[in-house]
Every structure is written in structure tokens, then in C-alpha cells.
């Protein structure tokens, strides 16, 4: 069953079919018997009960209230009413813009993952039996697709898929020609899910140190949740019982990506921690990242350029 | 007229994941998008995403991205949220809500009645 | 992504009194005469209730007391005259672009 119009604000465009589908259809089919009433109110008039003698655009089907074609005076609040059963709703109806084939108010935005799939399926299951042929647009150009009936775009997106797709159906009633037109603006956009992983600061690290003090390595990235960092060093990690790997902190940036950092620290530090390699490396599926730092001697800063120090 | 129904509260371990349900009420399923709002305790309303119900189509809150799942049954006029690799900061209830699909349509008028998930070791 | 900020953070007042409530959008939110702003209210225990669509239409059922105002980037919630029920915390939602977003609240209390 077609879906019944459950809201209770309705913006529609002058000039198209609209119906109004109240939400207690199949209640109203078990009690044929009871009095089901049509009411319109705007401004000054209070309550006017509608009826096919109101107008020659309005049409009345059992639970439905249709409009061949709503215009800019049917804009007011419209009533259902069934014994103790009433339903509301405020239409408004607004002006047709004359310079495209779409009204911007009338736009359902959808944002798409560029090799994603996408879709658009051009269907109006109400006025299905009516519709006569579609058609659909890309910024108002027609498309040449196959299906006149049910035009249909079925792809992995690219970024020239960008852009306000129309689907206008063509129908007929009482021998004239309408039509309803709905348009989605579609942005397509970079794989959102995933970031190539990075570590923050220099890719060597020259750390000025003293013999028998500690010292903080510190390692930063930007990572997904599922990336790995680690350090490196040594022969055998874990062979030097002054060294260790504090626990990993992570904390969530707002993009929903994560800044982790891990120290290593080195205690009592000894010769054999000088000028060795102590890596630091971040893993993703996407590939790694490393960076080194060295550990000198603060005897020796003067042979090596200022800016490689870290501290 | 439209009334939405969440299921009932969870308590869950961290790194577990969350299905929270809300059916729609009859009729009126694929005219509307639904979207799922959470709030933690004495903070803010925070959108977590929405779905299509008529074909499907979902957009995620980037905070989310990579741990929410929404999915729909067009049958029973139900629409589910799946969070997975729950933390303690997911503590929060998580209310679906419904909307037009037009852009200027995408307010909120009919909201469940929210569902408590707790994440505790 | 639009990020809505909403002033002043609490706002003391008692009833009878009026009171204006402030929502600013990092980037427009309107176009071709609408603006998608929309206005929440919500009590301690209960989901939050629509009082405002499209900046300044008044949701059915809501008490016209309560106003919305503005265009672009600025957007105003006037309670005209508080009753007590009105003591709550207010959202601003845009709805110009997803993602879709909500303002951090004004809470509203009794001076």
C-alpha cells in the first residue's frame, strides 16, 4: 500500500498533481458505512468541507484528496475526519521557478563516496498506472537512457557524477498532460571511511641526552582506529631492561580519526644507547610510516646542525 | 499520527557492539528518513546519521564512520543501529526520529522514545 | 560541516519575563527565501519536542509564545512571556547540508 501523507507540514509546487492520503485508509475500508469528511481552512474561512462540487481540480477516492493540479489559493490547513478520527495537515504550496526545471525547495541532498555505489531510480508508485513516460535530468540536461518508464542510474559513483538529477514524470487525467518532477543533489566526495595513517614531526630526531639521566621518546600520528603503532630498536626488542613502552594513549578528533601517542622511555642512560636507531613505526593496511630518533651525547650537539635537535 | 518504538535498554562490555531497533508505525515507513540522535549524560543532542528507508541510502556523522551500521526492514517497518567497538564515552541514549527528505524538510517532529545503552567493564 | 553555536550558554529569568535565545551557524543556512533552522525544546527524562521549523514556523500545538527569527547565518528563539513549564534546554538544529547538526543548547532556568 502507498504510504499515507503521516506529515503534518506539507511545501509542494503549483502547477503538479498532490494528493493527501489520510493514515487511517484501513480502518475507513471496515466501516464503509461511516461518514468520512474532507475540510479546508485559510485565513478568514473556517472549515469548508470539500467535495468534487468545490472545484473541478479536486478529486476525491476514498481515503484520498487529490489535486489536478494544486495551485497557489489550495495553500491553507486541510482536516480528515472519521467518526472520533481526525487528521491534520498545513499545506504550502509555492511558486514554480520559471527559470529551471526544479525548485530549490524541492531538493533531497545525498552525499556519495566517490567508487561507491549510487543510484538514482526514478519511480512515483501513486501515480504509477497514470504515468505516461519519464524522464531524467542532470542540471536540467535530459538523459538518454534506455527505460522511458522507469529511468534508473545504477554505477560506482565518479566525481562527474556530481550534480541535481530531475526525474519529471509525464501523465495524463481527464485529457490533460501534467507532470511531477523530483530532484536530488548529489555530491560526490573522497572516501570518507579511511586516511592514510602519518606521524607527526620530523622523520630524525637528533635527542641531546647524558649519560646515567632518562629520557621520553615521544611518537605521534593521525591513524585510523584499527592502525597500529610500535616502536623498534635493537637486536631483540626488550633486551635492554632500561627501556620501555609506555602504555599507547588515544584521544578521538572530531573527523572521527585518531591522534594515538606512545613513549618509549629510556632509563640510566648507558654508551651502548647512543647513536642506534630507535624506530617508531604506525601500520595500516594502507601501508606504514616511520620515524627515527637518535640519542647524543650533549658533549657532541656542536657537530651536528641546529635544526635536527628535538627535545 | 506516526509514533516510533525503541527496544529497551542495553548494558554492554567495551569493544562490543549495539543493535537498537524503532519501528515505525504503519503506512508511513518509506516517505520518511530516519535518523538517530544520541545524548550522553548532562550533554548535548549529537547526530549520529540517517537512512532512507525507500532505497536504502545512508549518511554517517564522521565520528562515526567505520563503527555505525543503520540498515531498514521494509516488512516490519523497522529501522536498526548497530555501534561496534563500544567505549565507555558511548554511554548515552540514542533516540531515532523522523524527517521529510527534502533538505528543508530534515527537522525532527516524531521521536522515539529513546533507548539507555551503557558501556561498562 | 556547518557548526551552529548558541548563546548565552545558561540564561537565568523568571517567569513572566521574555527571553531571547541566540543560535549562529559558521556558514549560511538559508537560500532562495527559506532557512533551515529549525528549534528544539527538551526537559530532564524526555525527548526533545520540535517548537520551530524553518526558523519561524510555529510547530502545531506549540503556544504562541514562542517565536523564531532570522536569516543567513543568525537565528533568535523568543519566548514572549515564560511560563513555568518553559524552563528547559533549547537546541538550534541546520538542516542546509548533511552532515545534519544541533547547536550545544541554552539551558533555561529560573532565576
Known amino acids: 500500500a502507498e504510504s499515507c501523507t503521516s506529515r503534518p507540514h506539507i511545501t509542494v509546487v503549483e502547477g503538479e498533481p498532490f494528493y493527501l492520503k489520510h493514515c487511517s485508509c484501513s480502518l475507513a475500508h471496515e466501516i464503509e458505512t461511516t461518514t468520512k469528511s474532507w475540510y479546508k481552512s485559510s485565513g478568514s474561512q473556517e472549515h469548508v468541507e470539500l467535495n468534487p462540487r468545490s472545484s473541478s481540480r479536486i478529486a476525491l477516492h476514498d481515503c484520498v484528496l487529490e489535486f489536478w493540479p494544486v495551485e497557489l489559493n489550495d495553500t491553507g490547513s486541510y482536516f480528515f475526519q472519521m467518526k472520533n478520527y481526525t487528521q491534520k495537515w498545513k499545506l504550502n504550496v509555492i511558486r514554480r521557478n520559471k527559470h529551471s526545471c526544479f525548485t530549490e525547495r524541492q531538493v533531497t541532498s545525498k552525499i556519495v563516496e566517490v567508487k561507491k555505489f549510487f543510484q538514482i531510480t526514478c519511480e512515483n508508485s501513486y501515480y504509477q498506472t497514470l504515468v505516461n513516460s519519464t524522464s531524467l535530468y542532470k542540471n536540467c540536461k535530459k538523459l538518454l537512457l534506455e527505460n522511458n518508464k522507469n529511468p534508473t542510474i545504477k554505477k560506482n559513483a565518479e566525481f562527474e557524477d556530481q550534480g541535481y538529477y530531475s526525474c519529471v514524470h509525464f501523465l495524463h487525467h481527464n485529457g490533460k498532460l501534467f507532470n511531477i518532477t523530483k530532484t536530488f543533489n548529489i555530491t560526490i566526495v573522497e572516501d570518507r571511511s579511511n586516511i592514510v595513517p602519518v606521524l607527526l614531526g620530523p622523520k630524525l630526531n637528533h635527542v641531546a641526552v647524558e649519560l646515567g639521566k632518562n629520557v621520553r621518546l615521544n611518537c605521534s600520528a593521525l591513524l585510523n582506529e584499527e592502525d597500529v603503532i610500535y616502536w623498534m630498536f635493537g637486536e631483540e626488542n626488550g633486551s635492554d631492561p632500561n627501556i620501555h613502552e609506555e602504555k599507547e594513549m588515544r584521544i578521538m578528533t572530531p573527523e572521527g580519526k585518531w591522534h594515538a601517542s606512545k613513549v618509549l622511555r629510556i632509563e640510566n642512560i648507558g654508551e651502548s644507547n647512543l647513536n642506534v636507531l630507535y624506530n617508531c613505526t604506525v601500520a595500516s593496511t594502507g601501508g606504514t610510516d616511520t620515524k627515527s630518533f637518535i640519542l647524543v651525547r650533549k658533549a657532541d650537539m656542536a657537530d651536528i646542525p641546529g635544526h635536527v635537535f628535538t627535545r | 499520527q506516526v509514533q516510533l518504538v525503541q527496544s529497551g535498554a542495553e548494558v554492554k562490555k567495551p569493544g562490543a557492539s549495539v543493535k537498537v531497533s524503532c519501528k515505525a508505525s504503519d503506512y508511513t515507513f518509506t516517505s520518511n528518513w530516519m535518523h538517530w540522535v544520541r545524548q550522553a549524560p548532562g550533554q548535548g543532542l549529537e547526530w549520529m546519521g540517517t537512512i532512507d528507508p525507500s532505497d536504502s541510502y545512508t549518511y554517517y556523522n564522521q565520528k562515526f564512520q567505520g563503527r555505525v551500521t543503520m540498515t531498514r526492514d521494509t516488512s516490519t517497518s523497522t529501522v536498526y543501529m548497530e555501534l561496534s567497538s563500544l567505549r565507555s564515552e558511548d554511554t548515552a541514549v540514542y533516540y531515532c526520529?523522523?524527517?521529510?527528505?527534502?533538505?528543508?524538510?530534515?527537522?525532527?517532529?516524531?521521536w522515539g522514545q529513546g533507548t539507555t545503552v551503557t558501556v561498562s567493564s | 560541516e556547518i557548526v551552529l553555536t548558541q548563546s548565552p550558554g545558561t540564561l537565568s529569568l523568571s517567569p513572566g519575563e521574555r527571553a531571547t535565545l541566540s543560535c549562529r551557524a559558521s556558514k549560511s543556512v538559508s537560500t532562495s527565501g527559506d532557512s533551515y533552522m529549525h528549534w528544539y525544546q527538551q526537559k530532564p527524562g524526555q525527548a526533545p519536542r520540535l517548537l520551530i521549523y524553518l526558523a519561524s514556523n510555529l510547530e502545531t500545538g506549540i503556544p504562541d509564545r514562542f517565536s523564531g527569527s532570522g536569516s543567513g547565518t543568525d537565528f533568535t528563539l523568543t519566548i514572549s512571556r515564560l511560563e513555568p513549564e518553559d524552563f528547559a534546554v533549547y537546541y538550534c538544529?541546520?538542516?542546509?547540508?548533511?552532515?545534519?547538526?544541533f547547536g550545544q543548547g541554552t539551558k533555561l532556568e529560573i532565576k
Open positions: 538544529q541546520q538542516s542546509r547540508e548533511l552532515p545534519l547538526s
Open positions: 526520529t523522523t524527517s521529510g527528505d527534502y533538505d528543508a524538510d530534515r527537522y525532527f517532529d516524531v
